[in-house]
C-alpha cells in the first residue's frame, strides 16, 4: 500500500535569465528511494538522480541543468519556452512510483522580481 | 574496432560461484557503461547489473543482490561478473554489452559473444 | 520496475511484405527505449536507440516511432536476414533496466 505523499513547490514563477530550482520532497513512507527522475512539460526527460550510480543529465540539458540541492534540480538561464509543467517522479521500493507537478512561469526581469520562491539571486 | 571477448563455457555445480570475464578494446574503457544480460535456454533478456568501469560503482537488480559482483580492472579494460550460490536456474548464456557513456545511460550497443554458464549436479 | 510488454509474440510474414513490432510500457520512458534483434546462436544486435535512432549500420528499412509507454518497430520490406527475435528496452528506470519478452518474426 503507498502511504507516502509528495511536497513541491507548487507553482513558481522566476526571471528569465535566471536560476530556479525545482524540489520535490517525499514524505510518509519508509520505502527506499531508489531513482528520481525530473521531466519537463513535454515528457522529455531532464535529469536522473539513482541512489546507487549517481546523476545523470540528459545531454541536451546539460548546459542549462544542475544537479541538486538534494533530489532537486537546478535551471539555469531561463528562457521563455522554459514556461510550463515539471514533474518529479519518485520510484520507490516496495511502494512503487510517486509522481509531484510543478509549474512554472518564467517572467520578463522586471515582473518576476517578488514573486519567485526557491530562487536563486 | 570496438569489441567485447567474453571468457569460455563453464560447468559449476549448484552452490558454487562462477567468475565470468569481459575485456573491452577499441574505446576508452572508462568512459562507458558495462551492463550484464543473461539468457536462459529458450528464453528472453534478463538485465543483472550495471557498473561504472571509470569509480566501480555498480547496480544489480534486487533478484540477483547479495549473489551478485561486478568490479572492473582498469589496467586491462576489463570487467567480471561473479556470481554464487549457484542454482539450476542459473544455467544460461551471461552476456557483456557496453551501455551509454557514463553521463547517461544509454543503449547497449555493443555485446560480447556471451559465455555459457551450466549449473549441474 | 517497469514492465515492458512486446506484441505479438509471433508474427509470421512473407519476404518483402511490412512488418510491425509493438511494445508498451507500464509507464512512460519518455524517447529511452531501444529494440535489439537477436538470432539463433548470436549476440543481440542494437537496432534503434532513443526510440526512433538507427544504429550505426542499420538498413533504413528498419524504423522505430513512438513516445511515452507507447512504441512501435516497422521493417519496412522484410528480407531473409530479418527473420528473428525482436526485444525492447527501457534505459529510464534501473535497478532493473527491463526487456520486454519478444517477438519471434517467422517465415509465413
Known amino acids: 500500500m503507498m502511504t507516502g505523499t509528495i511536497e513541491t513547490t507548487g507553482n513558481i514563477s522566476a526571471k528569465k535569465g535566471g536560476s530556479v530550482i525545482l524540489q520535490c520532497h517525499l514524505s510518509s513512507t519508509m520505502a527506499q528511494v531508489t531513482q528520481v527522475n525530473w521531466e519537463q512539460h513535454d515528457h522529455s526527460l531532464l535529469a536522473i538522480r539513482n541512489a546507487e550510480l549517481g546523476w545523470h543529465i540528459y545531454p541536451a540539458f546539460k548546459d542549462r541543468v544542475a544537479p541538486g540541492p538534494g533530489l532537486g534540480l537546478t535551471l539555469q538561464s531561463l528562457t521563455m519556452n522554459d514556461t510550463g509543467e515539471y514533474f518529479c517522479t519518485y520510484h520507490t521500493y516496495p511502494d512503487g512510483t510517486y509522481r509531484g507537478r510543478i509549474f512554472l512561469e518564467v517572467l520578463e526581469s522586471s515582473v518576476a522580481e517578488h514573486s519567485a520562491r526557491f530562487q536563486i539571486p | 574496432q570496438v569489441q567485447l571477448v567474453q571468457s569460455g563455457a563453464e560447468v559449476k555445480k549448484p552452490g558454487a560461484s562462477v567468475k565470468v570475464s569481459c575485456k573491452a578494446s577499441?574505446?576508452?574503457?572508462?568512459?562507458?557503461?558495462m551492463h550484464w544480460v543473461r539468457q536462459a535456454p529458450g528464453q528472453g533478456l534478463e538485465w543483472m547489473g550495471i557498473?561504472?568501469?571509470?569509480?566501480?560503482?555498480?547496480s544489480y537488480a534486487r533478484k540477483f543482490q547479495g549473489r551478485v559482483t561486478m568490479t572492473r580492472d582498469t589496467s586491462t579494460s576489463t570487467v567480471y561478473m561473479e556470481l554464487s550460490s549457484l542454482r539450476s536456474e542459473d544455467t544460461a548464456v551471461y552476456y557483456c554489452?557496453?551501455?551509454?557513456?557514463?553521463?547517461?545511460?544509454?543503449?547497449?550497443?555493443?555485446w560480447g559473444q556471451g559465455t555459457m554458464v551450466t549449473v549441474s549436479s | 520496475e517497469i514492465v515492458m510488454t512486446q506484441s505479438p509474440a509471433t508474427l509470421s510474414v512473407s519476404p518483402g511484405e511490412r512488418a510491425t513490432l509493438s511494445c508498451r510500457a507500464s509507464?512512460?520512458?519518455?524517447?529511452?527505449l531501444a529494440w535489439y534483434q537477436q538470432k539463433p546462436g548470436q549476440a543481440p544486435r542494437l537496432l534503434i536507440y532513443g526510440a526512433s535512432t538507427r544504429a550505426t549500420g542499420i538498413p533504413a528499412r528498419f524504423s522505430g516511432s513512438g513516445s511515452g509507454t507507447e512504441f512501435t518497430l516497422t521493417i519496412s520490406s522484410l528480407q531473409s536476414e530479418d527473420f528473428a527475435v525482436y526485444y525492447c528496452?527501457?534505459?529510464?528506470?534501473?535497478?532493473?533496466?527491463?526487456f520486454g519478452g519478444g517477438t519471434k518474426v517467422e517465415i509465413k
Open positions: 528496452q527501457q534505459y529510464v528506470v534501473w535497478p532493473p533496466l527491463t
Open positions: 557498473i561504472n568501469p571509470s569509480i566501480g560503482l555498480t
Open positions: 554489452a557496453r551501455g551509454g557513456r557514463t553521463t547517461w545511460i544509454g543503449a547497449l550497443d555493443i
Open positions: 577499441g574505446y576508452t574503457f572508462r568512459e562507458y557503461y
Open positions: 509507464q512512460s520512458v519518455s524517447s529511452n
